[in-house]
Amino acid sequence: CPTSCKCSASRIWCSDPSPGIVAFPRLEPNSVDPENITEIFIANQKRLEIINEDDVEAYVGLRNLTIVDSGLKFVAHKAFLKNSNLQHINFTRNKLTSLSRKHFRHLDLSELILVGNPFTCSCDIMWIKTLQEAKSSPDTQDLYCLNESSKNIPLANLQIPNCGLPSANLAAPNLTVEEGKSITLSCSVAGDPVPNMYWDVGNLVSKHMNETSHTQGSLRITNISSDDSGKQISCVAENLVGEDQDSVNLTVHFAPTITFLESPTSDHHWCIPFTVKGNPKPALQWFYNGAILNESKYICTKIHVTNHTEYHGCLQLDNPTHMNNGDYTLIAKNEYGKDEKQISAHFMGWPGIDDGANPNYPDVIYEDYGTAANDIGDTTNRSNEIPSTDVTDKTGREH
């Protein structure tokens, strides 16, 4: 444990002021694993003035950082870059004259306490005022800054000319594009101080490249992948005071593909499981032995899980018999194309010939998600119906 501090497996605390610490506490090699430290509490350390870029990086599991009644004057911009779990920071009663948004912009902080610091009134700390104004009143802190006359001004009253939140404006609010095509998005930003502009594309799969000047930018996405449908693309404007973003949702249209079709499995119903991808939502039609399968309450399509442009479901059959054995074909189509796949199903043998289920189709339990029916497309056609399945099979079992 660092000299003048105490440690447990998950906590470091340094509160004894004499002789105190002069640098941020670091664990000795072969001691406690720094990744397991979730809380660091530092108090009364008047000679602790700086948090350097690499002081905190080893504590990747850190959730609570408290440095109070100490001498903290400077925090390096990238000090908390590796501490994505940080939730609470308390820098009460230190010697901070300025503090940048950049320290915290990547963190999802639920608490940042800065009371009792001698902040200098400038645009550099306007973001703190903006943050305060965004919070509900019970959380507001009594923050002050020193003006040119060394007078304490409540941060809530701080007015700095040419110091405000930026704005971002994306040209295309609604974006629908066909798979394989390319698009260019344009964005303009404004503000004083002049903001930086960047694109936040998340985990976009499609190839993309951007060009940005100070206040204008474009993003070109080429050979758009169907995997990017539903993803959000944001243009972000950021300056000292804060950030603004304008976002667009990408909708990609593409022809259906049946990515999964398997032999029947039995749970409390028989199920021919399938997965279909497509956008717009494909219409589904089943064929039995080459003829249209007319769905009924005994044989029907159920969609159990919808994952944006992917649909997982079953052709559900209640108590099928030997009469339902045969070839089942699924056709999925939308305006961009169609796909089809076929499987052979054997539910039971002919009476007196084959008394059990075909060993090629064992009773594997299929996970039925139990959602309400979400049929895609209208597959009803009363001609050429196949036999209904509301019978008990000859072995006396009910499926």
């Epitope: 003048s4 105490k6 004499s18 002789p19 105190g20 009364n44």
Partner: antibody
């Protein structure tokens, strides 16, 4: 060499005011906390409070809060302990103490003590 | 503010080991120091940060601290060790001394 030199013994009457001093030398006076300790005749040691001369941040033990004032003048490297109205029960030896050094050396230093006698 | 409790007196024969305890709520979470005071003298720090000895303090003085108890151990006690001993710890906003123990070497 680190030294704390305290002012001389005082004899006072109840109700009078008093300010005793502790001058530090041989170390950075503004960079370390200085504390005051009371020892009444035949009794144990009691922490009264501490001060950080660099910014005058002061902490008092609950039983001494409001009874005494701890202050420091960094320009002359001197800490003070004062009473606005002495009582007979304030009769004691008062020590100032500092811990200015790094671990591994002698890490605290005490003044020689100031004897305060309050009697009518 | 927490109270640090010590036995009022401990007696030991020369050459034997003396142990003086100091009890306080969650004392093991704080650093304990030990002071020796002889009549008419200022206190002298003999143990700091639970178990560290300042230079010039004999090896026969050792310390430990866990749970709610800190312990000062004097092995091979000598007549010159007869004195008052005080534990001390930082408690939230200031230091606290223990009630003090008079060590008598028989």
């Amino acid at each position: 060499e680190v030294q704390l030199v305290q002012s001389g013994a005082e004899v006072k009457k109840p109700g009078e005011s008093l300010k005793i001093s502790c001058k530090g030398s041989g170390y950075s006076f503004t960079s370390y906390w200085i504390g005051w300790v009371r020892q009444m005749p035949g009794k144990g040691l009691e922490w009264m409070g501490i001060i950080y001369p660099g910014d005058s941040d002061t902490r008092y033990s609950p039983s001494f809060q409001g009874q005494v004032t701890i202050s420091a003048d960094k320009s002359i490297s001197t800490a003070y302990l004062q009473w606005s109205s002495l009582k007979a029960s304030d009769t004691a030896m008062y020590y100032c103490v500092v811990r200015p050094a790094a671990a591994g050396t002698r890490i605290d230093y005490w003044g020689q003590g100031t004897l305060v006698t309050v009697s009518s | 503010q927490s109270v640090l409790t010590q036995p009022p007196s401990v007696s030991v024969s020369p050459g034997q080991t003396a142990s003086i305890t100091c009890s306080g709520d969650k004392l093991g979470d704080k650093y304990a120091s030990w002071y020796q005071q002889k009549p008419g003298q200022s206190p002298v720090l003999i143990i700091y940060q639970d178990n560290k000895r300042p230079s010039g303090i004999p090896e026969r003085f050792s310390g430990s601290n866990s749970g709610n108890t800190a312990t000062l151990t004097i092995s091979g006690t000598q007549a010159m060790d007869e004195a008052d001993y005080y534990c001390q710890a930082w408690d939230s906003s200031t230091y606290v001394f223990g009630t003090g123990t008079k060590l008598t070497v028989l």
